[in-house]
Interface confidence: medium
Amino acid sequence: DAEFRHDSGYEVHHQKLVFFAEDVGSNKGAIIGLMVGGVVIA
């Protein structure tokens, strides 16, 4: 499981880096596939 602690500086626990995305726009409503702080968060 990938547990996301977005509210603590985007710390990621037990994160499996399943994919990366070239598009790193800031559209908050589409976090899947975006990267924050260099790690995939969803």
Epitope: D23, G25, G29, A30, G33
Partner: antibody, heavy 121, light 108 residues
Framework: EVQLQQSGPELVKPGASVKISCKTS????????MHWVKQIHGKSLEWIGG????????NNNQKFEGKATLTVDKSSSTAYMELRSLTSEDSAVYYC??????????????WGQGTSVTVSS | EIVLTQSPTTMAASPGEKITITCSGS???????LHWYQQKPGFSPKLLIY???NLASGVPTRFSGSGSGTSYSLTIGTMEAEDVATYYC?????????FGSGTKLEIK
């Protein structure tokens, strides 16, 4: 007004594939993750996966790997889910559901009306 | 995956009665990532409460939510006939996102 309009009911044979559509309006399609959720009659909800319409990147429930493929067509603001190698266990209502704008928390603030898929020979 | 267990599975309440539905996680959930949905018979689910305690747009104030860790609850302050539905909790903290088993609320 945000609207998610899904395609109509499907009756398909075992082993076949089906592609369900979810046409959106009332918001900027590329700014909200689109999720797909399965509901077998009278039972709970099961998250299939989500897709970022901006770049087509998906994240799926491993249970549905090889079963469900999520895609989008940005030009028509439509999300699609293809289900393949259908069996009776795939008979269900399938919903598309948009993440709320603050998708960091992944609540789903707008749902399609559902598409019934029946697998029968 | 995080399994969400709701209780009770089914309940019947009289108009005006206070209702509490609980959602228990198999692992801890950050409160920002726990949401509640209402599904009336024959309709799609509707977002009711997001991030544990925030009412979605248009939701009556008789609904409220609370909780932390592995234990969350949905409360209806005074049951009304229009509240007959099945209620689901959902977590967005861990992939795969999961929903609770559901609580069917009926009226006496």
């Amino acid at each position: 007004e945000v609207q998610l309009q899904q395609s109509g009911p499907e009756l398909v044979k075992p082993g076949a594939s089906v592609k369900i559509s979810c046409k959106t309006s009332g918001y900027t399609f590329t700014e909200n993750t689109m999720h797909w959720v399965k509901q077998i009659h009278g039972k709970s909800l099961e998250w299939i996966g989500g897709i970022n319409p901006n770049n087509g990147v998906t994240n799926n429930n491993q249970k549905f790997e090889g079963k469900a493929t999520l895609t989008v067509d940005k030009s028509s603001s439509t999300a699609y889910m293809e289900l393949r190698s259908l069996t009776s266990e795939d008979s269900a209502v399938y919903y598309c559901a948009r993440s709320d704008y603050d998708a960091l928390y992944y609540s789903m603030d707008c749902w399609g009306q559902g598409t019934s898929v029946t697998v029968s020979s | 995956e995080i399994v969400l267990t709701q209780s009770p599975t089914t309940m019947a309440a009289s108009p005006g009665e206070k209702i509490t539905i609980t959602c228990s996680g198999s692992s801890s959930i950050i409160s920002n990532y726990l949401h509640w949905y209402q599904q009336k018979p024959g309709f799609s689910p509707k977002l009711l409460i997001y991030r544990t305690s925030n009412l979605a747009s248009g939701v009556p104030t008789r609904f409220s939510g609370s909780g932390s860790g592995t234990s969350y609850s949905l409360t209806i302050g005074t049951m009304e006939a229009e509240d007959v539905a099945t209620y689901y909790c959902q977590q967005g903290s861990s992939i795969p996102f999961t929903f609770g088993s559901g609580t069917k609320l009926e009226i006496k």
